[in-house]
């Protein structure tokens, strides 16, 4: 099949001590080979601070995964979402103030 | 082969602006951050502030918050340092570097030297 | 701002001879942030070793990187010429980022 750009939706949820959980959301993408990893200043975190989904097909010939970290609160427009796929890429903010999500089709 | 290409050195007067240009190659553009230091004559690095070429965010050390303004041209693949109210104590060589995958400055400019003086 | 002090200022030693840089922070940090540089006389720094230990593409095994928490440490196992220059250690855990004030590893 031809190449289908993920839609990226990151959202961020409390939790507690000062700290949030932010998740990068991509799906409806396809091929299923897709990078995602949570940025702090553009430097990818390391593997053991971030939790990943599998890449799971989402019922429409394409798919979905997901990946997540904590970060302090306050520090939000520190980190980004890095995607590649296909040859695109692209990085995706945290949401600030009372946003908490924000998607992104990749064209 | 990444590299990062500078501009030419300048000499500035006290109260001026000064801008800097960075051309990076080698990947794309957009992909990674672009760091600003500076390092005055013998002295140590001072970071000013990184911009994400994709999205345009900008962080900027507070100090130099008020004075400083990075940019990015999409378009030509170049990122730019501006600094305003310019004193003889920026005399500075201006380095820009590339955010890495596991450090924030994997690749260097060659620098551009900043003299300010009247 | 996380102050990171390194020492001593200079160090002084002959080729062969074994090179131990500190880098002592005024907060810990993780070790995923601390990294290290080498800047030669009229150049552009280098990295040298990123998040304490891991050695950065094409860095002679000569060079090593180890610590933790608050107390960072640079090794070069036995000194080549081309060894010797400033190098500065960079955290970047907190903002602003910050970097050390250098070591000058000199020919004695």
């Known amino acids: 099949g031809s190449t289908v750009p993920p839609m990226v939706n990151v959202t961020c949820s409390e939790v507690s001590e000062g700290n949030i959980t932010v998740t990068c959301r991509a799906s409806s993408f396809y091929p299923r080979n897709i990078t995602l990893t949570w940025r702090q200043d553009g430097v990818s975190l390391s593997h053991n601070t971030q939790q990943w989904g599998d890449v799971l097909p989402d019922g429409n010939g394409t798919y979905q995964t997901w990946v997540a970290t904590r970060i302090r609160q306050g520090e939000e427009q520190r980190f980004t979402c890095y995607m590649e796929h296909s040859g695109n890429h692209g990085t995706h903010p945290v949401p600030s103030g009372n946003s908490h999500h924000h998607h992104h089709h990749h064209h | 082969e990444i590299q990062l290409v500078q501009s030419g050195a300048e000499v500035k007067k006290p109260g001026a602006s000064v801008k800097v240009s960075c051309k990076p190659s080698g990947y794309a553009f957009t992909s990674n951050n672009i760091y600003w230091v500076r390092q005055a004559p013998g002295q140590g690095l001072e970071w000013i502030g990184y911009?994400?070429?994709?999205?345009?965010?900008?962080i900027y050390n507070q100090q130099f918050k008020d004075r400083a303004t990075l940019t990015v041209d999409k378009s030509t693949s170049t990122a730019y340092l501006e600094l305003s109210s310019l004193r003889s104590e920026d005399t500075a060589v201006y380095y820009c570097?590339?955010?890495?995958?596991?450090?924030?400055?994997?690749?260097w400019g060659q620098g551009t030297l900043v003299t300010v003086s009247s | 701002e996380i102050v990171l002090t390194q020492s001593p200022a200079t160090l002084s030693l002959s080729p062969g001879e074994r090179a131990t840089l500190s880098c002592s922070a005024s907060s810990s940090i993780s070790s995923n942030y601390l990294h290290w540089y080498q800047q030669k006389p009229g150049q552009s720094p280098r990295l040298l070793i990123y998040r304490t230990s891991n050695l950065a593409s094409g860095v002679p095994a000569r060079f090593s990187g180890s610590g933790s928490g608050t107390d960072y440490t640079l090794t070069i196992s036995s000194l080549e010429p081309e060894d010797f220059a400033v190098y500065y250690c960079?955290?970047?855990?907190?903002?602003?980022?910050?970097f050390g004030q250098g070591t000058k590893v000199e020919i004695k």
């Open positions: 960079q955290q970047g855990g907190s903002l602003p980022l910050t």
């Open positions: 570097s590339r955010s890495g995958e596991r450090s924030n400055f994997d690749y």
């Open positions: 911009i994400d070429p994709y999205i345009g965010r900008i």
